[in-house]
Amino acid sequence: EAYKSEIAHRYNDLGEEHFRGLVLVAFSQYLQQCPFEDHVKLAKEVTEFAKACAAEESGANCDKSLHTLFGDKLCTVASLRDKYGDMADCCEKQEPDRNECFLAHKDDNPGFPPLVAPEPDALCAAFQDNEQLFLGKYLYEIARRHPYFYAPELLYYAQQYKGVFAECCQAADKAACLGPKIEALREKVLLSSAKERFKCASLQKFGDRAFKAWSVARLSQRFPKADFAEISKVVTDLTKVHKECCHGDLLECADDRADLAKYMCENQDSISTKLKECCDKPVLEKSQCLAEVERDELPGDLPSLAADFVEDKEVCKNYQEAKDVFLGTFLYEYARRHPEYSVSLLLRLAKEYEATLEKCCATDDPPTCYAKVLDEFKPLVDEPQNLVKTNCELFEKLGEYGFQNALLVRYTKKAPQVSTPTLVEVSRKLGKVGTKCCKKPESERMSCAEDFLSVVLNRLCVLHEKTPVSERVTKCCSESLVNRRPCFSGLEVDETYVPKEFNAETFTFHADLCTLPEAEKQVKKQTALVELLKHKPKATDEQLKTVMGDFGAFVEKCCAAENKEGCFSEEGPKLVAAAQAALV
């Protein structure tokens, strides 16, 4: 159906509330430095304009594209040049170049301070005083910190946030009610952001085919009763949705996501037996529920994979007649039979299968050549299995903090050129894989761990791309999406690294360390560990363990002292001197 006015179409489809929320998110993701009030004003103006176009589609400017309307609105911001520098040059361009220019200026690491919640009473007062403004502020603060956040999912989280306050602001002990609920939501939001950033990177750096392959594997595991045609349909629609959101087309993305949810619910008989509960919910919850739905049971009588993909005499003919469909079918069949494998592993197996067919179908006797192809998968399967086993054992021995430190040492030695805050952030997140996955049953560990690692390593790649300092990091990040994790795992100590000059300032601590929350205390200690390694990259694990032990004791001692600052300034230099001597 052709619409005279695209903006009216989206306003009608999405409804005023969701429309306004998505516009606010879009502007906050593009202009990350602007104050909340400016964005509220812009979003209000765009929503009023859309409402007018919905009432009269042939009104002035209603026929303009969304990019034109949004871009024109962004370019009216007076402080554009002061706040964003060369981003203001985007406004000299015409669409679609102008939008591409805005996208290129999105900052994955804007460096805003972490969100600190005011007192519960103040929060509840703000919530009750103006709910819409309160939730708008939430959308704004998340969106500007996470410029690739999946917008329709952010609307869902805002709804959850609203629910938490509606409940807890009535509670006798507001703080006790809010604390754990807000923290649990925060964890979900951070993971959601990282997952979508990975999807956007897949699309932007490796193209539709990579994203589709990833989605075929994931959805085939989740919906093993669906046939390949059904999986292909959902994957094609899902790819469009994520391309739109990653490209800043948030209204189209949210609208198409709602359409996909509708399609899945109308066709649940041919997709999965697990969708029923999701399909009774309103649109935001429905889409979220479908995205998180549990895996369906495997059909009982699946034939052996070998019949179609090895033993069939016409494998090469079938492959050559429609390569992508044949490989897609292979990936689908393999994935639905192996819910315990990570998506990354399944994609490596499909890649190996493709390489084998490319090689064998060019020989005189293809069947003999590819006869053992499924057996040749064993080392590819063993590698992540062994990695997960070894690292979970280490995690169980050391606990989360100790495991993070082991990873900090490991990754600093692999890529010492990478900035200390990035190494600390990424290693802390890599360490969380233990907490998240190692307690799971054996059948879920690999899938949980490796796919989570892919998401975290993507964060490293995204941050490193902004300021590239290590050729080996660039190589691991850009050569192959599915081999990123094995590439990083395979990196040894960087022998070319020239140790950093010693800087006493880096190892100077103050009494304010004592009042920090535990997590921030850990970050300070881990920052010191990385700096120590950059200064002494040849330090052994034993030496590091000793120095870190001494450091912990020093912090504990000075934080218990009467004159904390005096203790830090007196004992600190002694500790540094002892550490330097120990690491000679």
């Epitope: 045609a229 292909s232 094609t236 041919s270 179609d308 016409e314 079938n318 007649e321 429609a322």
Partner: nanobody, 118 residues
Framework: EVQLLESGGGLVQPGGSLRLSCTAS????????MGWVRQAPGKGLEWVSW????????YYADSVKGRFTISRDNSKNTLYLQMNSLRAEDTAVYYC???????????WGQGTLVTVSS
């Protein structure tokens, strides 16, 4: 190249039956969802029925539910449509279609005409 050859159409009285067949070649039949699409005089294309590659799941348009039965024989690369209790409104050209993705088809045959009239 992909070929789909329908047969079995013809003139039949209301309430009568017909069995359409479609022989496929040029692609791996057992890997694809297959279906029947029809076009009544002066109307658009309409999915009548489809069947999964392994035959375990079938779909029927509401207008033919309970009267038509789709089946396939992967060893013979053949698709069937058993049509019972035929009505005048079933008059159409019936096309056998290969589907690589739900809701779409990339190849279809020449079609076979089914006329239901007394």
């Amino acid at each position: 190249e992909v070929q789909l050859l329908e047969s079995g159409g013809g003139l039949v009285q209301p309430g009568g039956s017909l069995r359409l067949s479609c022989t496929a070649s040029g692609f791996t039949f057992r890997h694809y969802r297959m279906g029947w699409v029809r076009q009544a005089p002066g109307k658009g294309l309409e999915w009548v029925s489809w069947i999964r590659p392994d035959g375990t799941f079938t779909y029927y348009a509401d207008s033919v539910k309970g009267r038509f039965t789709i089946s396939r024989d992967n060893s013979k690369n053949t698709l069937y449509l058993q049509m019972n209790s035929l009505r005048a409104e079933d008059t159409a050209v019936y096309y056998c279609a290969k589907s690589y993705m739900a809701g779409t088809f990339d190849y279809w045959g020449q079609g076979t005409l089914v006329t239901v009239s007394s």
